[in-house]
Interface confidence: medium
């Protein structure tokens, strides 16, 4: 019973870090710079997201614009798109394993094959965990690298973004989750008659001597 | 409708002083932000001094022309804005105009009030 | 501060197309978002905003204006020209402070 308290758990816990996961992909928050001026009329944020860039004036008025191309795009968020939109899909995938090798659903009927396929899905959550957690990482590295360099000008230098908290957050919730899919160990094989067999075996031999 | 009417104009002495009133209707006053911009007579626009709303708390801004002469203050339970003008210079003279600030551009104007300084 | 230049005027026909320009000394761009912006001053009034952040039309402002550019050149387009359009035309930055606007274009009749 613990057992699949702990499988729900992990079901839980993988399907909120892949909720977590298209938020991060979609909230134009992954790279924030503020253009705060000595004056409302130039100040002003532009936060960059992987599908578009906003900019956001001091009254409150906010614009986005969804990017032209591929091209429009820095290539280290080229690369984050990818990365994330694999992570969704692989975490998908393991949401659709983790229903089929679920105790409470009726998809398989081997409860060996049960937990070998629950154990398949939390390989593929770590994977999605691990996916996220590399691009969010590595944006956050270039951003804290460009701001501590002082060839970088100060008007140039970006924040870190919600898009990249909220993407730490569904990498851990991947990976605990996984990570508690994993710890499903599969029932032991040994049957009843198996048992009984080797201990006729043990009393013949003993009779024999 | 917005409207933004501005009075306090007039004749004023070189080194005296004016103040000038702006008052707003028709829009959510609180929430913006103000500016004024002269045009002297024959020339182009000029941003003097602006504030901000109160999220930005009333941040204010002026002009290298017009700093430690002017000051502009708002009263956002009346709508309006002013700028006193202290210490006043010939090249003051312009006509002077109310507006509201969007975003990042002058959204609606007053029609001006007129500043003449001159001895 | 970030100069605006643009040239003091314009002659056109009515019904032909009125090309405006501006330069900026550097560019008003930050991230894909033109920081340009285009007013119309009609004689004996005030100021009027047509084009916010380069391409966008105010609100109440007829299709025939358009505007255009990046980085430190910018066009205000009318097309067609009518007789209610004779005004001088001014571009301003809110890329940086303090914000600045250009000298003005007269646009007149030919």
């Known amino acids: 019973m613990a057992s699949m308290g702990l499988q729900v758990m992990g079901i839980a816990l993988a399907v909120l870090g892949w909720l977590a996961v298209m938020l991060c992909c979609a909230l134009p928050m992954w790279r924030v710079t503020a253009f705060i001026g000595s004056n409302i009329v130039t100040s002003q944020t532009i936060w960059e997201g992987l599908w578009m860039n906003c900019v956001v004036q001091s009254t409150g008025q906010m614009q986005c614009k969804v990017y032209d191309s591929l091209l429009a795009l820095p290539q280290d968020l080229q690369a984050a798109r990818a990365l994330v939109i694999i992570s969704i899909i692989v975490a998908a995938l393991g949401v659709l394993l983790s229903v089929v090798g679920g105790k409470c659903t009726n998809c398989l009927e081997d409860e060996s094959a049960k937990a070998k396929t629950m154990i398949v899905a939390g390989v593929v959550f770590l994977l999605a965990g691990l996916m996220v957690i590399v691009p969010v990482s590595w944006t956050a590295h270039n951003i804290i690298q460009d701001f501590y360099n002082p060839l970088v000008a100060s008007g140039q230098k970006r924040e870190m973004g919600a898009s990249l908290y909220v993407g730490w957050a569904a990498s851990g919730l991947l990976l605990l989750g996984g990570g508690l899919l994993c710890c499903n160990c599969p029932p032991r094989t040994d049957k009843p008659y198996s048992a009984k067999y080797s201990a006729a075996r043990s009393a013949a031999a003993s009779n024999y001597v | 409708e917005v409207q933004l009417v501005e009075s306090g104009g007039g004749l004023a002495q070189p080194k005296g002083s004016l103040k000038l009133s702006c008052a707003a209707s028709g829009f959510d006053f609180d929430s913006y932000g103000v500016s004024w911009v002269r045009q002297a007579p024959g020339k182009g626009l000029d941003l003097v001094a602006d504030i901000s709303s109160k999220s930005y708390n009333y941040a204010t801004f002026y002009a290298d022309s017009v700093k430690d002469r002017f000051t502009i203050s708002r009263d956002d339970s009346q709508s309006m804005v002013y700028l006193q003008m202290d210490n006043l210079k010939t090249d003051d003279t312009a006509l002077y105009y109310c507006?509201?600030?969007?975003?990042?551009?002058?959204?609606?104007w007053g029609q001006g009030v007129m500043v003449t300084v001159s001895s | 501060d970030i100069v605006l230049t643009q040239s003091p005027a314009l002659a056109v026909s009515l019904g032909q197309r009125a090309t405006i320009s501006c330069r900026a000394s550097q560019s008003v761009s930050i991230s894909g978002f033109n920081l340009m912006h285009w007013y119309q001053q009609k004689p004996g009034q005030q100021p009027k905003l047509l084009i916010y952040r380069a391409s966008n039309l105010a609100s109440g402002i007829p299709a025939r204006f358009s505007g255009s550019g990046s980085g430190t050149d910018f066009t205000l387009t009318i097309n067609p020209v009518q007789a209610d359009d004779i005004a001088t035309y001014y571009c301003?930055?809110?890329?940086?402070?303090?914000?600045?606007f250009g000298e003005g274009t007269k646009l007149e009749l030919k």
């Open positions: 507006t509201v600030i969007a975003g990042g551009y002058l959204d609606y």
């Open positions: 301003q930055q809110s890329r940086e402070s303090p914000p600045t």
